[in-house]
């Protein structure tokens, strides 16, 4: 009996692999170990087939490799003898999306595995609060995202649709701004951006607190709590306190959870260490002056959430100061 005459046919397997733009990925392929191993990874589009990586006669063969894959692919050469034909793919680009076939031939069989590669990107979005003249706006912004995300807004937990969307990047990655006019409103707002491919969701929440009326020389406590519903215990986050003045934001304090470092840019600003340990980032501003009147913004941000809390502080002259005038 000539064993070489008996060849096993294995139907084409298909796997979907999801990678991130700029990162590395492994396209998996395995086979029943055997001698005389030949591996051909190819990329298939509607019209052509492109050589991605080949291996035969005991070494990688890149003479006919398509230039777009140069220095970006390799096999696990030490693992081939164990049946591993997986491709290590470096620095993914959106153009790498598509169908890859891995042909593996040995002395006794040939198989073809199909891998569908999808590439996504989701740079952490931001929620910004802006004042333009007498108008107030909330902007949800994602600098780089692919594929197009689903963006939803809620006002007091009720979905709303009236927002202004701007998009750049015709083929992707996209840069998207979604703007909501919230002039005169003291409702809470929530913006959610979802990348369905990467199964990643980011939520920005904006809350306007009741206005605080204080007298000159007094101190004020501005509340800002990290809500456990939003943040998991081991998640890194940052807290920024800033002041909005004539549409310009100036930072007052900054805290980084990963290093537990706090930086103050205003000497009259402080927070209670005890409260901070309980994820309460409420601030004290002492020795108030008339010029301290305005909007104070607390921003707690992680990869998945941004919580914006706005306080409006009105500082009024004390009686002594009033009678001096």
């Amino acid at each position: 009996i000539f064993l070489s005459a008996f060849f096993t046919y294995v139907p084409m397997n298909e796997q979907i692999i999801i990678g991130r733009l700029g990162e590395d990925i492994i396209l998996p392929s395995s086979f029943e170990r055997g001698s005389e191993v030949v591996i051909h990874w190819k990329y298939q589009d509607s019209y052509n087939s492109y050589n991605v990586h080949s291996y035969y006669k005991g070494s990688g063969r890149l003479e006919s490799q398509d230039t777009r894959y140069a220095n970006r692919t390799s096999l696990f050469y030490n693992e081939i003898q164990n049946g591993n034909a997986s491709l290590f793919f470096r620095r993914l680009s959106l153009l790498d999306e598509g169908i890859y076939t891995c042909y593996v031939g040995t002395a006794i069989q040939a198989i073809t595995n199909k891998v569908v590669l999808k590439v996504g990107v989701f740079l952490t979005p931001m929620m910004k609060y802006e004042k333009r003249n007498t108008n107030s706006f909330l902007i949800c912004n994602v600098l780089s995202v692919y594929p197009r995300p689903i963006i939803t807004w809620k006002m007091d937990n009720t979905p709303i649709s009236e927002n202004n969307m701007q998009e750049t990047g015709s083929l992707g990655p996209f840069s998207i701004n979604s703007t909501l006019n919230i002039t005169g409103s003291n409702s809470s707002y929530e913006c959610t951006i979802e990348n369905s491919l990467l199964k990643q969701t980011w939520t920005g929440r904006w809350t306007m607190k009741d206005g605080l009326h204080k007298m000159q020389s007094e101190h004020v406590s501005l509340s800002c709590e990290l809500v456990n519903d939003y943040f998991s215990p081991n998640q890194d986050f940052k807290v920024t306190w800033s002041r909005m003045e004539s549409g310009i934001s100036s930072i007052l304090a900054y805290y980084l959870s990963s290093s537990q470092n706090t930086t103050f840019y205003e000497s009259r600003f402080s927070w209670n260490k005890e409260l901070k340990n309980q994820s309460d980032f409420s601030m004290n501003l002492t020795d108030l002056s008339l010029s301290d009147s305005g909007e104070y913004l607390c921003n707690i941000s992680s990869d998945e959430y941004t919580l914006l809390t706005i306080h409006t502080v009105h500082v009024e002259p004390s009686q002594e100061t009033a009678s001096d005038n």
Partner: antibody, heavy 121, light 106 residues
């Protein structure tokens, strides 16, 4: 079992063309590279051309480059050799041979019985 | 192009003899060498690949050795069925055959 059957040979005048075919059975045709090898009467073997499993690559011996074209139709499980500008020195038995796998290895566990091409005026 | 030179061109031997055929490459071909047996009017038959690997179904009296540029095919004990022409083939770079060695009965 693997079977390769060549056809299309015959007598042809110098400068004319001929097309050889090789019908395959007994294996998954689209998984294997295929070669043409020839043997002039009373002489040794000469490799002519190879085409890879998916038709993506083809290579030729210098003696036939630019005159012969190897092709395949995976749906018909057939291999072809289009021979143009034939010369007397192309007279030979033409064998269809299957590569060990994709075509990249270049040796032949399976052969057809051959078809004779005679180039003569 | 890589040239393959076989020696001898003709070899006379008797049943039971141990015979050796040599094949020399014009440049190193690592171990990418195959040996074939061909009988008159028939297609060649693969005996050895990768210089020393025995193709399945081929009797163990056939063996191959060598690497680089020098290779040998050995038949340890000639059988009546072994009288034929033997070809070496390099497949390091495309493919080239040796001119053949005719093994005939003494």
């Amino acid at each position: 079992q693997v079977q390769l059957v060549e056809s299309g040979g015959g007598v042809v005048q110098p400068g004319r063309s001929l097309r050889l075919s090789c019908a395959a059975s007994g294996f998954t045709f689209s998984d294997y590279g295929l070669h043409w090898v020839r043997q002039a009467p009373g002489r040794g073997l000469e490799w002519v051309a190879v085409i890879w499993y998916d038709g993506s690559e083809e290579y030729y011996a210098d003696s036939v480059k630019g005159r012969f074209t190897i092709s395949r139709d995976n749906s018909k499980k057939s291999l072809y050799l289009q021979m143009n500008s034939l010369r007397a020195e192309d007279t030979a038995v033409y064998f269809c041979a299957r590569d060990r796998n994709s075509g990249a290895l270049g040796y032949f566990p399976h052969w057809g019985q051959g078809t004779l091409v005679t180039v003569s005026s | 192009d890589i040239q393959m030179t076989q020696s001898p061109s003709t070899l006379s031997a008797s049943v039971g003899d141990r015979v050796t055929i040599t094949c020399r490459a014009s440049q190193s071909i690592n171990n990418w060498l195959a040996w074939y047996q061909q009988k008159p009017g028939k297609a060649p038959k693969l005996l050895i690949y990768k210089a020393s690997s025995l193709e399945s179904g081929v009797p163990s009296r056939f063996s191959g050795s060598g690497s680089g540029t020098e290779f040998t095919l050995t038949i340890s004990s000639l059988q009546p069925d072994d009288f034929a022409t033997y070809y070496c083939q390099q497949y390091n770079s495309y493919s080239t055959f040796g001119q053949g060695t005719k093994l005939e009965i003494k």
